[in-house]
């Protein structure tokens, strides 16, 4: 056998090159036939009425032909025939790769609520071979479940991702990325998650700055509430008691002037949105007014637990009191 060919893999729409090579040629007729065994080239002449085939080279040792705008129907075995004694035949297989026509991502719900499980589907249509679909949430790879549908040698792949969403996922992209031999680089599509979550409430003491509340001083607390949608209602209440008459409420701020011991108690900031409500408590303890210097030494320790409860413990060495819990977030 001194007739040689090589298999060809080509992307749909591109150019395939078919080469019939002869070692030790005696100038015998070389023919190239298509998978239907119709003659494409007889020596350097193309009898076949398909002008996509063009002669690249013809000599006694090679017949080289290009096929432009390759389609999936061109796939198959192409035969090189060399009419020596005995006649020789060799075939080259053209494999046509078809990149996915369309990549579509579909989220079951435009807006999800924290803790909810949502379904995300990604479909890569009409590729050959079947596409591999990978899922990412931000930079984290997730595992989906793929189904492959075959139709006329083409494959449509649908991958399903079940995703339990958390508030941290709001604004994070869910990325459907395809891997396919006909695709160079990244082919991907993404949708940004919109996650609604109940407010997170945090109380900030904006005055006094040193954090120690004494009789006669003023107190200013600011309630920070973050949620999605943004909380519509932020309210201050005094737990198990009436709000002092000299307290002033201004939006998220609570002012109490001229503090006295009767103001001791728990002050709660409540915030709500359509997802739910949450609150944070501030425990006010009014200390005696200062007598003389030296100034107090204040130590603040913040501990965050998994339930995001913030404990602020303030110890005043001069006051002769035990450390007390000043703020609790819920």
């Amino acid at each position: 056998q001194n007739l040689f060919t090589k298999d060809v893999t080509v992307i749909e729409g591109e150019v395939a090159t078919i080469s019939c090579q002869v070692n030790k040629s005696d100038d015998s007729v070389i023919q190239l036939l298509n998978p239907n065994r119709q003659t494409i080239y007889f020596r350097d002449f193309r009898p076949l009425k398909d002008s996509r085939f063009q002669l690249l080279n013809f000599s006694s040792s090679e017949l080289k032909v290009s096929l432009t705008n390759v389609s999936i129907s061109d796939e198959g075995r192409y035969f090189c025939q060399l009419y020596t004694d005995p006649p020789q035949e060799s075939y080259t297989t053209i494999t046509v790769l078809v990149p996915p026509r369309n990549l579509m991502i579909d989220i079951q719900k435009d807006t999800a609520v924290e803790g909810e499980e949502i379904e995300v589907n990604c479909t890569a249509m009409a590729s050959k071979p079947a596409t591999t679909i990978r899922w990412f949430k931000g930079n984290t790879e997730l595992k989906g479940k793929s189904e492959v549908e075959e139709w006329s040698d083409m494959y449509t792949v649908t991958s399903q991702l079940m995703l339990k969403v958390h508030k941290e996922d709001d604004g994070v992209p869910v990325i459907c990325q395809v891997e396919h031999p006909a695709v160079t680089g990244n082919l991907q599509t993404q949708r940004y998650l919109e996650v609604q979550y109940k407010p997170q409430v945090h109380i900030q003491m904006t005055y006094p700055l040193q954090g120690l509340t004494r009789e006669g001083d003023a107190l200013e607390l600011t309630c920070e509430a973050i949620g999605k949608p943004q909380p519509v209602m932020v309210t201050w209440v005094r737990v198990d008691d009436e709000m002092p008459q000299h307290a002033v409420l201004s939006g998220p701020n609570l002012f109490i002037n001229n503090l006295n011991k009767t103001d001791n108690g728990t002050y709660r900031c409540e915030a709500s949105n359509i997802v739910g409500k949450a609150h944070s408590d501030y425990m006010l303890y009014v200390y005696d007014p200062p007598t003389t210097i030296p100034p107090p030494t204040t130590t603040t320790t913040t501990t965050t637990t998994t339930t995001t409860t913030i404990l602020t413990i303030i110890t005043d060495s001069r006051a002769g009191e035990e450390g007390s819990i000043r703020a609790v977030d819920h």
Epitope: D26, D27, S28, V29, N36, R37, Q38, T39, F42, R43, F45, R46, P47, L48, K49, S51, S60, Y83, T84, D85, P86, P87
Partner: antibody
Framework: QVQLVQWGAGLLKPSETLSLTCAVY????????WSWIRQPPGKGLEWIGE???????NYNPSLKSRVTMSVDTSKNQFSLRLNSVTAADTAVYYC?????????WGKGTLVTVSS | PELTQDPAVSVALGQTVRITCQGD??????ASWYQQKPGQAPVLVIY?????PSGSGSSSGNTASLTITGAQAEDEADYYC????????????FGGGTKLTVL
């Protein structure tokens, strides 16, 4: 300048064997197929078959059972034998060079079959 | 025959004439055309898409055409189309021939 020169018996009796030879002068012998075509008087052309230098043949199915083609590469010649001829085989027989199409023809040999 | 031609066609001197050939094999393969004058061997005039020693050819679907522009007296001849069976046998097939008369 390639030339095809053909010869053979011009008058045959029914049941005899027609025998014609065509010599190729100039050009490549192995680089082509070589064909025989006939034309009955006042009628159209009929393809008989073809052969290459290594003896590979392709015959018209309607004549296949009676036709034999052969080649002599040392002389750049190819031959046609048609067995059991009848009056229906009376025709001008042409040899031709095959480049898929027939680009060179011999002058033709009239073969008459008559008792 | 598996290639069909009109038996006879006539054309006025200097005019254009079109000779057609029909057959299934012409869906896949180009036809070649031969001119034959009385007592002579056929001569190749068209092959492939429109490769020509003379004349011009075209092809569409299962029909091939030979067009002679500005017909002259010397164009008067028999014209044969030829192709090959598009099955794997590749046997040669000729049309029945068209007699062209130049008036």
């Amino acid at each position: 300048q390639v030339q095809l020169v053909q010869w053979g018996a011009g008058l045959l009796k029914p049941s005899e064997t027609l025998s014609l030879t065509c010599a190729v002068y100039g050009g490549s012998f192995s680089g082509h197929y070589w064909s025989w075509i006939r034309q009955p008087p006042g009628k159209g052309l009929e393809w008989i078959g073809e052969i290459n230098h290594s003896g590979s043949t392709n015959y018209n199915p309607s004549l296949k059972s009676r036709v034999t083609m052969s080649v002599d590469t040392s002389k750049n010649q190819f031959s046609l034998r048609l067995n059991s001829v009848t009056a229906a085989d009376t025709a001008v027989y042409y040899c031709a060079r095959v480049s898929w199409y027939f680009d060179l023809w011999g002058k033709g040999t009239l073969v008459t079959v008559s008792s | 025959p598996e290639l069909t031609q009109d038996p006879a066609v006539s054309v006025a001197l200097g005019q254009t004439v079109r000779i057609t050939c029909q057959g299934d094999s012409l869906r896949s393969y180009y036809a070649s055309w031969y001119q034959q004058k009385p007592g002579q061997a056929p001569v190749l005039v068209i092959y492939g898409k429109n490769n020509r020693p003379s004349g011009s050819g075209s092809s569409s679907g299962n029909t091939a055409s030979l067009t002679i522009t500005g017909a002259q007296a010397e164009d008067e001849a028999d014209y044969y189309c030829n192709s090959r069976d598009s099955s794997s046998t590749h046997r040669g097939v000729f049309g029945g021939g068209t007699k062209l008369t130049v008036l």
